[in-house]
C-alpha cells in the first residue's frame, strides 16, 4: 500500500495472507468460513511450492493470539483467468477445515448486485505489500482510502486505453494507491466487499494508472457455485 | 459489435446553427469517452475536443471552444455537437469516435456544409 | 500546441515496395506516465480513419504485419515493408500525449 497508514490491529478481520513456503505472496478475504477469495495471478509461479494462509494477523512476523495458518484444501482459479490478461483475476482457496472465528477471524460480506459503485465513493484496501518504490515490505498490515473512478476516464488512452471491461473497476492512485504485494485483497466500500486488487504488472502511484479491481458482484454466480 | 453512427449534416447558411448526433451501440456508453474530429475537403484530420459521459466534463481544442458545445443523453446512447455562429471555414466532415482503445472506433462520418 | 510534421506530404510507389513515412514532433511527446501516445491511422477515400498502430509500435488488431512503427522522443517511423494494392491512402500520425491531441497534416501514398 502506498501512502497509506499502519491499520488499527484485527479491525479488518476478513483479511488474509496468502502465502508460499511461508512467505506472504497475495493479499486475500475471506468470504465464507473455509473460502478465502484472491487473485488467480497470485498462484501462476507457485509451481510445487507449499500455499497456506494466514488469518488473524496483523503482524506477519510476530506472534499474536487471533493467528492461524491454515493449509489450502484446493485452489480453483477462474476457468477464465490467463497468464496475460487482467480479465477474470480471481481465485478461490478452500482451507483445510473451517476457519476458527473470533472478534480477528470473520467473513466480509460480499457485493452480489452487480450495479456500479458510484464514481468518487471512498473505498478501503488493504494489505501487506510494498509501501514505497524502493520495494519496502511492511510487516504490519497497512491501508489506505481511495475515491473510485469512473470507467471512461480509467479506459481513456493514457490510463488504461480500453482496457476496463465493466467486470473491472478502478480507484484513483495519485500516490496512494495498492501495489505489490497487494493483489488478492479486498476493495471495501461501506463494510462490503466490492473488488478485488487484480495482480497485473501496473506501475503504482501515478494518477494515470489508476488501480485496477475485480468486481465481485460480476462473478456471484462463479463464487456460489464453487462454495455450494 | 461496435458502432457509432452520425447524423444531422446538411446544408446550412453562414451564421446559423446545428446539431449533430453520434448514436452508439454495441457497448457500454457511458464506459468510454466520446471526442469529435473533423476534416475539411481535401484536409487534414482536426480535433474538436471529448466529453466525459459519466460526468459531462468537456475538453475542447481552444479553436472551437466558443461556438461549439458537446451534450449527451445518455439514456439514448447518443453524444451531440452543437455548433452555432457557423461559416464557411466550418465545411467538413464531423466523425465522433470512442476514445479506448485509442480511436479504434469511428462513426461513418456526417457533411456540414456552410453556405450562402 | 504539439504540431506533427510529416513526411514527405506525398509519394509514389509501386506494388512490393518498401515505404517509409515519418513524423516529427515539435516537443517530446513522452507522457508523465512515461508512456509514449504516437498513433498511425489508414484512410481512404470517403471513408473514416483506421487505427494501424499504438503507442508508437503496437499493431491494433488485425492490421497486418507488413505494417510496423518506431521511433523515440520526437522522431517517428511508419513503414510498410511490402506495399499492397489496398495500401494505396493517405496515413496521419497522431499524439495522444498532450491536450489538445494533435493530428499530422497527411501523407499521400499513390501509385506510381
Known amino acids: 500500500i502506498l501512502g497509506g497508514r499502519e491499520a488499527e490491529a484485527h479491525a479488518r478481520p476478513y483479511m488474509a495472507s496468502v502465502q508460499l513456503n511461508g512467505a506472504h505472496l497475495c493479499g486475500g478475504v475471506l468470504v465464507a468460513e473455509q473460502w478465502v477469495l484472491s487473485a488467480a495471478h497470485c498462484l501462476e509461479d507457485a509451481a510445487d511450492g507449499k500455499v497456506q494462509v494466514l488469518l488473524g494477523a496483523h503482524s506477519l512476523s510476530q506472534p499474536e493470539p487471533s493467528k492461524r495458518l491454515y493449509d489450502v484444501l484446493r485452489a480453483v482459479p477462474h476457468p477464465d483467468s490467463q497468464p496475460d490478461t487482467i480479465d477474470h483475476d480471481l481465485l478461490l482457496l478452500q482451507l483445510s477445515e473451517k476457519a476458527t472465528l473470533g472478534p480477528a477471524v470473520r467473513p466480509l460480506p460480499w457485493q452480489r448486485v452487480d450495479r456500479d459503485v458510484a464514481p468518487g465513493t471512498l473505498c478501503d484496501v488493504a494489505g501487506w505489500g510494498i509501501v514505497n518504490h524502493a520495494g519496502r515490505r511492511p510487516d504490519s498490515l497497512q491501508h489506505v482510502l481511495l475515491p473510485v473512478l469512473d470507467r471512461a476516464t480509467c479506459n481513456r488512452r493514457t490510463h488504461h486505453d480500453g482496457a476496463i471491461t465493466e467486470r473491472l473497476m478502478c480507484a484513483e492512485s495519485n500516490r496512494r494507491d495498492s501495489c505489490k504485494g497487494d493483489s488478492g485483497g479486498p476493495l471495501v466500500c461501506g463494510g462490503v466487499l466490492e473488488g478485488v486488487v487484480t495482480s497485473g504488472s501496473r506501475v503504482c502511484g501515478n494518477r494515470k494508472k489508476p488501480g485496477i479491481y475485480t468486481r465481485v458482484a460480476s462473478y456471484a454466480a462463479w463464487i456460489d457455485s464453487v462454495l455450494a | 459489435e461496435v458502432q457509432l453512427v452520425e447524423s444531422g449534416g446538411g446544408l446550412v447558411q453562414p451564421g446559423g446553427s446545428l446539431r449533430l448526433s453520434c448514436a452508439a451501440s454495441?457497448?457500454?456508453?457511458?464506459?468510454?469517452?466520446m471526442n469529435w474530429v473533423r476534416q475539411a475537403p481535401g484536409k487534414g484530420l482536426e480535433w474538436i475536443g471529448d466529453i466525459n459521459p459519466v460526468t459531462g466534463d468537456t475538453d475542447y481544442n481552444a479553436d472551437f471552444k466558443r461556438r461549439f458545445t458537446f451534450s449527451l443523453d445518455t439514456s439514448k446512447s447518443t453524444a451531440y455537437l452543437q455548433m452555432n455562429s457557423l461559416r464557411a471555414e466550418d465545411t467538413a466532415v464531423y466523425y465522433c469516435t470512442r476514445e479506448g482503445p485509442s480511436f479504434a472506433y469511428w462513426g461513418q462520418g456526417t457533411l456540414v456544409t456552410v453556405s450562402s | 500546441d504539439i504540431q506533427l510534421t510529416q513526411s514527405p506530404s506525398s509519394l509514389s510507389a509501386s506494388v512490393g515496395d518498401r515505404v517509409t513515412i515519418t513524423c516529427r514532433s515539435s516537443q517530446t511527446i513522452v507522457h508523465s506516465n512515461d508512456d509514449t501516445y504516437l498513433e498511425w491511422y489508414q484512410q481512404k477515400p470517403g471513408k473514416a480513419p483506421n487505427l494501424l498502430i499504438y503507442?508508437?509500435?503496437n499493431r491494433w488488431s488485425g492490421v497486418p504485419s507488413r505494417f510496423s512503427g518506431s521511433g523515440s522522443g520526437t522522431d517517428f517511423t511508419l513503414t510498410i515493408s511490402s506495399l499492397q494494392p489496398e495500401d494505396f491512402a493517405t496515413y496521419y500520425c497522431?499524439?495522444?500525449?498532450?491536450?489538445?491531441?494533435?493530428f499530422g497534416q497527411g501523407t499521400k501514398v499513390e501509385i506510381k
Open positions: 497522431f499524439q495522444g500525449s498532450h491536450v489538445p491531441v494533435t
Open positions: 503507442k508508437v509500435s
Open positions: 454495441g457497448y457500454t456508453f457511458t464506459d468510454y469517452y
